[in-house]
């Protein structure tokens, strides 16, 4: 079932899914000047058996100037819709490594995407929060929100997660809320393109999250 | 109490355009996107798109993508959909409906009839 | 697209009466939503998520099934159910509706 909503938007984060349930959609979207090719599919769909997920579908992006004797890029399967960023394929390498059952990995990159994904994300989705460079985290629970579904509607679950200026007194936590807005509801549907420069972290930290998101997944 | 009222009725020449408008009150506009879906005479219903009114993306059915623009304004809480180029196919009713999962609130539909 | 596939498309039968109908998707679904339309007015949220009774609906009313077959079921039949019935699934985009079932005055 989709989330008819998007993950809670927290101040000076950014947050991404390590795996894509089965069931999540990714739009095929291209840069200017291109378009998806008029028989290609709109989306690329995570789905499987119970041995294996992978993306149905494959974005195509062909000239816009073009008539119909454009090259027809084939792009490598794999998107959603509800956040995005290629640069953020770099990060969190381990999902490459790891296979979580029901789920499909970051889709590779296609000729002429554009610039941010648009994923759908699905009931049973989690997604994973950090702070921007420049902040740090103050934690008072997981840094995580999971889209549930309750008498028919979908929520995001709030992330426990507040990120304070290096140069800001630090908050304990406790002291201030989450940015959030009204119902635990979203307050963007598509996030700034984040650049790999926003989601660079030091190393020790990127290793802790890894190892704290792996362990979370598989409990 | 929740309630999502729409714009009267509107008979409109065909290649013109019409837009239709879905005032809500009762709920945090801002926190459900809303959903158009479209009922033409004796069929059934065809989901049109939605649009989330706190960002303004939106996302459409295929079919209607040429077709239909779903605008929202936050300042009055209401939610457009405009149709362009008209035909006597896109004669229907018009429903506007507030998501967050399964279509729980319900405008009255606008009935749009194109006739020369 | 998921095609949704109702049956049968008109129904007549009488006050007391049990009436199913069925809704059959072109592909797996996780759930499957219910709407009643009378003429003239909007659609009404009947059951949601395959099973679950919307606000206000009677317990006459009952859902049922799983992938891609999917039932709604009126024990027995009053009055106020004749109408159209609609199944929809938002698993995937674009969400979808079945073309309808006329319940009608035998």
């Known amino acids: 079932e989709l989330c008819d909503d998007d993950p809670p938007k927290i101040t000076h984060a950014t947050f991404k899914a390590v795996a894509y349930k089965e069931g999540t959609m990714l739009n095929c979207e291209c840069k200017r000047g291109f378009r998806r090719i008029k028989s290609g599919s709109p989306y690329m769909l995570c789905t499987g058996n119970s041995s294996h997920s992978s993306w149905d579908n494959q974005c195509q992006c062909t000239s816009s100037a073009a008539r119909n004797t454009t090259k027809q890029v084939t792009p490598q399967p794999e998107e959603q819709k509800e956040r995005k960023t290629t640069e953020m394929q770099s990060q969190m390498q381990l999902a490459d490594q790891v296979s979580l059952p029901g789920h499909c990995r970051e889709p590779p990159p296609w000729e002429n995407e554009a610039t941010e994904r648009i994923y759908h994300f699905v009931v049973g989705q989690t997604v994973y929060y950090q702070c921007v460079q420049g902040y740090r985290a103050l934690h008072r629970g997981p840094a995580e929100s999971v889209c549930k579904m309750t008498h028919g509607k979908t929520r995001w679950t709030q992330p426990q997660l507040i990120c304070t200026g290096e140069t800001e007194p630090s908050q304990f936590p406790g002291e201030e809320e989450p940015q959030a807005s009204p119902d635990g509801l979203p307050e963007s549907e598509t996030s700034r393109l984040v650049t790999t420069t926003d989601f660079r972290i030091q190393t020790e930290v990127a290793a802790t999250m890894e190892t704290f998101i792996f362990t979370t997944e598989y409990q | 109490q929740v309630q999502l009222v729409q714009s009267g009725a509107e008979v409109k020449k065909p290649g013109s355009s019409v837009k239709v408008s879905c005032k809500a009150s009762g709920y945090t506009f801002t926190s459900y996107r809303m959903h158009w879906v479209r009922q033409a005479p004796g069929q059934g219903l065809e989901w049109v798109g939605y649009i989330n009114p706190s960002s303004g993306y939106t996302e459409y059915n295929q079919k209607f993508k040429d077709k239909a623009t779903i605008t929202a304004d936050e300042s009055t809480n209401t939610a457009y959909m405009e149709l362009s180029s008209l035909r006597s196919e896109d004669t229907a009713v018009y429903y506007c409906a507030r998501g967050g999962g399964v279509f729980d609130y319900w405008g009255q539909g606008t009935l749009v009839t194109v006739s020369s | 697209d998921i095609q949704m596939t109702q049956s049968p498309s008109t129904l007549s039968a009488s006050v007391g009466d049990r009436v199913t109908i069925t809704c059959s998707a072109s592909?797996?679904?996780?759930?499957m939503h219910w709407y009643q339309q009378k003429p003239g007015k909007a659609p009404k949220l009947l059951i949601y998520t395959t099973s679950n009774l919307a606000s206000g609906v009677p317990a006459r009313f009952s859902g049922s099934g799983s992938g891609t077959e999917f039932t709604l079921t009126i024990s027995s039949l009053q009055p106020d159910d004749f109408a159209t019935y609609y199944c929809?699934?938002?698993?995937?985009?674009?969400?979808?509706f079945g073309q309808g079932t006329k319940v009608e005055v035998k």
């Open positions: 929809h699934q938002r698993s995937t985009y674009p969400l979808t």
């Open positions: 592909s797996s679904i996780s759930y």
